[in-house]
Interface confidence: low
């Protein structure tokens, strides 16, 4: 997928913008938002009734280096008596970020946009119930 | 890509930290599409922790177009689809990268930004935790 | 512990209006959420309006357009403000909120907690 160059008014190209060579453009990695703070539910992985676990990923390569991945705990969903209701499903809940590639060719490198799919965590579902004809 | 000459003995520079700033090829690689999540999945409406979801755009900012999960529901559905207010619907956050025009309104010139969104909705057991 | 503590209840005519107010006292340490379910003669309880941490809100259909809630953070309150009421509209609303606190040095990281309730009765 391409950025696509926006052709409304609105995107009047302003004479600040710097000098991009063609097929590429300008990025900063300097984090806008850098140390803003999560302020989500405390254990939240092990306190849903469809626990999760997370994985940390590495990559010297990428930028960020470290992606954090959630996967399910059960297939079936945590009862209020602790035990595995597989009538329920433990599903995984995804959304996509942007990571910078960086790539080695000989003794040149080069960098590319790429977007990632991240598992959050997980929620509890009614299965759908197909039916066999 | 754009390639960056590297320096005399390349094979052990520039592998520990990414420059500031660098020129990136316009062609983003990936293989999944940026999906609406209404299409992609009904788990929002089968969840016990239901949720909605709200459209945020903004052209300055690419992808220009966020789905922003809300629960709908301070508790969670049970079997006999009545919230139980003994179990509480949660939102699940996550922090992205997106890329923000810099300088506003440069066609091809961007900044890495930060955001915060919330993804779904989880239920959870009112637990304590013990404070040492 | 938490303390939830509505006011503004009270007896109203049809088309009228009514403002209602929910303090939330005690060792909080942050309110995810807080809003108004109510619950009518015989009926289950339900949402009128949540409003999030962010300040986003939602609305229950039935009220979108006719019922406003905001909040004040360094309050620890939040208000629901009913216009154009409807005899429908009688019920006992009552004010939650998912609150993580503190009491006796353990942490409550997410709980909901309810108010005692506040009657509204639209009527002629």
């Known amino acids: 997928r391409k950025i696509p160059k926006v052709g409304h008014t609105f995107f009047q190209k302003p004479e600040s913008c710097p000098p991009v060579p063609g097929g590429s453009m300008k990025l900063d990695i300097g984090i806008i938002n850098e140390n803003q703070r999560v302020s989500m539910s405390r254990n939240i992985e092990s306190r849903s009734t469809s626990p999760w676990n997370y994985t940390v990923t590495w990559d010297p390569n990428r930028y960020p280096s470290e992606v954090v991945q959630a996967q399910c705990r059960n297939l079936g969903c945590i009862n209020a008596q602790g035990k595995e209701d597989i009538s329920m499903n433990s599903v995984p809940i995804q959304q996509e970020t942007l990571v910078v590639r960086r790539k080695h060719q000989g003794c040149s490198v080069s960098f590319q946009l790429e977007k990632v799919l991240v598992t959050v965590g997980c929620t509890c579902v009614t299965p759908v119930i197909h039916h066999v004809q | 890509g754009i390639t960056i000459p590297r320096n005399p003995g390349c094979p052990n520079s520039e592998d520990k930290n990414f420059p500031r700033t660098v020129m990136v090829n316009l062609n983003i690689h990936n293989r999944n599409t940026n999906t609406n999540p209404k299409r992609s999945s009904d788990y929002y409406n089968r969840s016990t922790s239901p949720w909605n979801l709200h459209r945020n755009e903004d052209p300055e900012r690419y992808p220009s177009v966020i789905w922003e999960a809300k629960c709908r529901h301070l508790g969670c559905i049970n079997a006999d689809g009545n919230v139980d207010y003994h179990m509480n619907s949660v939102p699940i956050q996550q922090e992205i990268l997106v890329l923000r025009r810099e300088p506003p309104h440069c066609p091809n010139s961007f900044r890495l930004e930060k955001i915060l969104v919330s993804v779904g909705c989880t239920c959870v057991t009112p637990i304590v935790h013990h404070v040492a | 512990d938490v303390q939830l503590v509505e006011s503004g209840g009270g007896l109203v005519q049809p088309g009228g209006s009514l403002r209602l107010s929910c303090a939330a006292s005690g060792t909080i340490v942050n309110i995810h959420v807080m809003g108004w379910y109510r619950q009518a003669p015989g009926k289950q309880r339900e949402l009128v309006a949540l409003?999030?941490?962010?300040?986003?809100?939602d609305y229950a259909d039935s009220v979108k357009g006719r019922f406003t809630i905001s909040r004040d953070n360094s309050k620890n309150t939040v208000y629901l403000q009913m216009n154009s009421l409807r005899p429908e509209d009688t019920a006992v609303y009552y004010c939650?909120?998912?609150?993580?606190?503190?009491?006796?040095?353990?942490?409550?990281?997410?709980?909901?907690?309810w108010g005692q309730g506040t009657l509204v009765t639209v009527s002629s």
């Open positions: 409003i999030f941490s962010g300040g986003s809100a």
């Open positions: 939650a909120a998912e609150i993580g606190y503190y009491s006796g040095g353990t942490y409550y990281s997410s709980e909901a907690h």
